[in-house]
């Protein structure tokens, strides 16, 4: 409708690390004369409409979400309307809405992505002595507590992919973080190094494990 | 139970304006969006505009722009739509219908509850 | 303009299972659009049946369901009742202002 109050989010997701804080933008354009007393704003999750913040009655309603969220009382009058949402959690994930209302209303979601980097990987190998080549061993790659869930690529030493016989399970924990626990189980030859990759979709960060198995005694790489 | 009733029929010359009223009753919801929604013989349901009683913010929409007006009386939880300049073709059922700005209950049922109806006839 | 699209008319049986889509000019439909299903039946107001994409109100039997497929925004009765026979209408929220579809003839044979 004509003259409706244009609100204005991101387009594209919000990425915030988990237990950062993360600023949620929106911004309206205020008409000539405007006055905070003018202003009704409503931060809800999009989904249920429950309510997040609120600033209505000329003031500041305070936070409905935890006590975790705060607006930036001194840019209303500008028109940012962008909500900061404190020690960013996985169970935040998701969109919420920014709810304008002055002479006329209007809204706009913004979405939240939550993303936390994987720790390197620990190897381990099963069995883990007196190995021969023709023996199958069983490597296995753990990374822990990422988010979202992790995508995991295993490779040779010459980095051709190793991709039968992998078997990969992933567990939240309390927080809703992820382990992530990768099999390979493979039929060693000569000598040969066996590497794993653990890639964070979000952040696009990668994660590296290698062992290597050089006849007898087997070494794992140092620690970076 | 929160209900809607809404003023009765009404037959208008062209050119003259009608004022409908919508009275919610059996407890209100805070902040709500009151839609007007109208029907003519035949037709489908087509949005008019809508008002936050507890704001006393409305938004029109682009067609009716001009000629409608919604206002609310938030002591008396009505909520009126005028409609002037009024045409042969505005002969329809009105309806006010209940949303939730912010749903309480933490479940937004949308346009849950509306008003009966109010048969308006444009007539020379 | 906004346009949105549903099936003019649908015919089921008892017993069966049908959906209705509400396809939007814009784009995919999404969750921020709200999703609304209205149900009218001859000589009586509109009545919400599912609101925020997928929430049944108050008094609307279970088997009726809310949800978004391939980008559009559907209803589905699953063990259709005789008494469903009615015209049911989307709306989606865009901003600041509900539109309506043209509504689907539900017809039970």
């Known amino acids: 409708p004509t003259g409706a109050v244009e609100v204005q989010v991101p387009e594209d997701p919000v990425v915030a690390l988990v237990g950062t804080d993360a600023t949620l933008r929106c911004s309206f354009s205020p008409e000539p004369g405007f006055s905070l007393a003018q202003l009704n704003l409503i931060w809800q999750l999009t989904d249920t409409k429950q309510l997040v913040h609120s600033f209505t009655e000329g003031r500041d309603q305070g936070s409905a979400y935890a006590n975790r969220t705060a607006l930036f009382p001194d840019l209303l009058a500008q028109g940012n309307a962008s909500l900061r949402l404190q020690r960013v959690r996985v169970a935040d994930e998701g969109s919420f809405t920014c709810f304008v209302s002055i002479r006329d209303f209007g809204s706009a979601a913004v979405s939240l992505q939550v993303a936390a980097p994987y720790s390197k990987p620990s190897m381990t190998l099963e069995p883990n002595k007196d190995l021969r080549p023709g023996d199958t061993v069983t490597i296995t790659c753990s990374s822990y507590r990422g988010y979202p869930e992790a995508e995991v690529f295993w490779q040779d030493g010459q980095g051709v992919p190793l991709t039968g016989n992998v078997t990969t399970s992933q567990m939240a924990n309390e927080q809703g973080l992820f382990d992530v626990h990768s099999v390979l189980r493979v039929v060693l030859g000569a000598n040969g190094t066996y590497s794993c990759l653990v890639r964070n979709p979000v952040l696009q960060q990668d994660a590296h494990g290698s062992v290597t198995i050089t006849g007898q005694p087997m070494t794992f790489p140092p620690e970076a | 139970q929160v209900q809607l009733v809404q003023s009765g029929a009404e037959v208008k010359k062209p050119g003259s304006s009608v004022k409908v009223s919508c009275k919610a009753s059996g407890g209100t919801v805070r902040p709500a969006l009151i839609n007007w929604v109208r029907q003519a013989p035949g037709q489908g349901l087509e949005w008019m505009g809508g008002?936050?009683?507890?704001?006393?913010?409305?938004n029109y929409a682009q067609k009716f722009q001009g000629r409608v007006t919604i206002t609310a009386d938030e002591s008396t939880s009505t909520a009126y739509m005028e409609l002037s300049s009024l045409r042969s073709d505005d002969t329809a059922v009105y309806y006010c219908?209940?949303?939730?700005?912010?749903?309480?209950?933490?479940?937004?049922?949308?346009?849950?509850?509306w008003g009966q109806g109010t048969t308006v006839t444009v007539s020379s | 303009d906004i346009q949105m699209t549903q099936e003019p008319s649908l015919t089921t049986s008892p017993g069966g299972t049908v959906t209705l889509t509400c396809r939007s000019s814009t784009g995919a439909v999404t969750t921020s659009n709200y999703a609304n299903w209205v149900q009218e039946k001859p000589g009586q107001a509109p009545r919400g049946l599912i609101g925020?994409?997928?929430k049944r109100a108050p008094g609307t039997p279970a088997r009726f369901s809310g949800s978004l497929i391939g980008g559009k925004a559907a209803l589905t009765i699953t063990g259709v009742q005789p008494e469903d026979e009615a015209i049911y209408f989307c709306a989606l929220w865009y901003s600041n202002l509900w539109v309506f579809g043209g509504g689907t003839k539900l017809e039970i044979k």
């Open positions: 008002i936050i009683p507890l704001f006393g913010t409305a």
């Open positions: 219908a209940r949303d939730q700005v912010v749903a309480t209950s933490g479940v937004n049922f949308g346009m849950d509850v």
């Open positions: 925020g994409t997928n």
